[in-house]
């Protein structure tokens, strides 16, 4: 499978909410011997590999924000902890997987990564990630609502496997 990032850039005004999205593409196994670990984190554009550094989003680590479930289950993060920070990550039956950030501030600007790990019981795993930029703007140049910029076809299948 691969991870697609439908949008590579989100430009939002301060105070707005935004939902960053990734999508699983390709065949997804749904047996008892496989589980999917999905999460979000902030990162930087590393010299060697984008998304290798896993920094917290509003003080919540990628482990706080993780979802895990079988192939076709929907899942949400634990509401209490995430919602206290204005965050919610969710996953549906169609491979879409998102994080919603409420009441954006300038400090939320940066590179965001979604990570999907397909974990099998016989000690194998397959990791893919997608990256997208969030720019939070203030003042007269800021848009009134979030503006999203589609990924190029090359970027939209932003794949890294381990």
């Amino acid at each position: 499978f691969k991870v697609a990032t439908p949008y590579s850039l989100y430009v939002c005004p301060e105070g707005q909410n935004v939902t960053l999205t990734c999508r699983l593409l390709g065949p997804v196994d749904k047996g008892h011997d496989v589980t999917f670990y999905k999460t979000w984190y902030r990162s930087s554009r590393g010299e060697v590999q984008t998304c290798s550094e896993r920094r917290p989003i509003r003080n919540l680590t990628f482990q706080d924000l993780h979802l895990h479930h079988g192939g076709h289950q929907a899942a949400n993060t634990s509401h209490d902890l995430a919602q206290r920070h204005g965050l919610e990550s969710a996953s549906d039956h169609h491979g879409n997987f998102s994080i919603t950030m409420r009441n954006l501030t300038l400090l939320d600007s940066g590179l965001y990564c979604c990570l999907v790990v397909e974990i099998r019981h016989h000690h194998s795993e397959h990791r893919v990630h997608g990256a997208m930029e969030l720019q939070v703007q203030t003042g007269k140049d800021a848009p009134s609502n979030c503006v999203v910029y589609p990924s190029s076809s090359q970027d939209s299948e932003n794949i890294t496997a381990a």
């Epitope: 482990q63 019981h121 000690h123 795993e125 381990a162």
Partner: antibody, heavy 120, light 107 residues
Framework: QVQLVQSGAEVKKPGSSVKVSCKAS????????ISWVRQAPGQGLEWMGG????????NYAQKFQGRVTITADESTSTAYMELSSLRSEDTAVYYC?????????????WGQGTLVTVSS | DIQMTQSPSSLSASVGDRVTITCRAS??????LNWYQQKPGKAPKLLIY???SLQSGVPSRFSGSGSGTDFTLTISSLQPEDFATYYC?????????FGQGTKVEIK
């Protein structure tokens, strides 16, 4: 904050078995791999095997296959490592440690270690 | 199995020195390389993951670099609490394997 608390030191006779426990608190237990790593006196770190509780089945280093059994009890958030047919070379500190993601990623939380002494 | 080779096996240094430890993998592991610090009688502690990312709470004098087969852990200015043994670990494939360790001693 995640904590892994291991059972106390053991002294065992050659040929016997030992079972070490590792109780996790402060985080999700079921979906994270727990590995067991041992360290003989003055030596380096050696991976023995691991388990992801939701799967129930464990994976073992070839060297320990057939002699080690790793299990997990989701109801008590506890992982166990049992080593049989003990010999003097098994004298070591045994650590449990949690992987941040999947089977092979970094070990971000460690237990305090359990010293197992094998002596006649 | 992927073999991990660290060098040197031990080194003597003074407080304030810049210290470099290297780790070589027997095959390419991309950036799936982690570094740990262990003090006598204590469990190892994660310092660096994914070759160059600093684990939360670890002082910025520690840094990591490299990809493929060759990796480096650098302590920019050695502090008294840094005298310990350092291990690399590959996280690219099963089974996970560690380097043999590098002991950093006081000169």
């Amino acid at each position: 904050q995640v904590q892994l608390v291991q059972s106390g030191a053991e002294v065992k006779k050659p040929g016997s078995s030992v079972k070490v426990s590792c109780k996790a608190s402060g985080g999700t237990f079921s979906s994270y791999a727990i590995s067991w790593v041992r360290q003989a006196p003055g030596q380096g770190l050696e991976w023995m095997g691991g388990i992801i509780p939701i799967f129930g089945t464990a994976n073992y280093a070839q060297k320990f296959q057939g002699r080690v059994t790793i299990t997990a009890d989701e109801s008590t958030s506890t992982a166990y490592m049992e080593l049989s047919s003990l010999r003097s070379e098994d004298t070591a500190v045994y650590y449990c440690a949690r992987h941040s993601i999947g089977w092979v990623a970094e070990l971000d939380y460690w237990g305090q270690g359990t010293l197992v002494t094998v002596s006649s | 199995d992927i073999q991990m080779t660290q060098s040197p096996s031990s080194l003597s240094a003074s407080v304030g020195d810049r210290v470099t430890i290297t780790c070589r993998a027997s095959q390419s592991i991309n950036t799936d390389l982690n570094w740990y610090q262990q003090k006598p009688g204590k469990a190892p502690k994660l310092l660096i993951y994914a070759a160059s990312s600093l684990q939360s709470g670890v002082p910025s004098r520690f840094s990591g670099s490299g990809s493929g087969t060759d990796f480096t852990l650098t302590i920019s200015s050695l502090q008294p609490e840094d005298f310990a043994t350092y291990y690399c670990q590959q996280g690219a494939s099963d089974p996970i394997t560690f380097g043999q360790g590098t002991k950093v001693e006081i000169k």
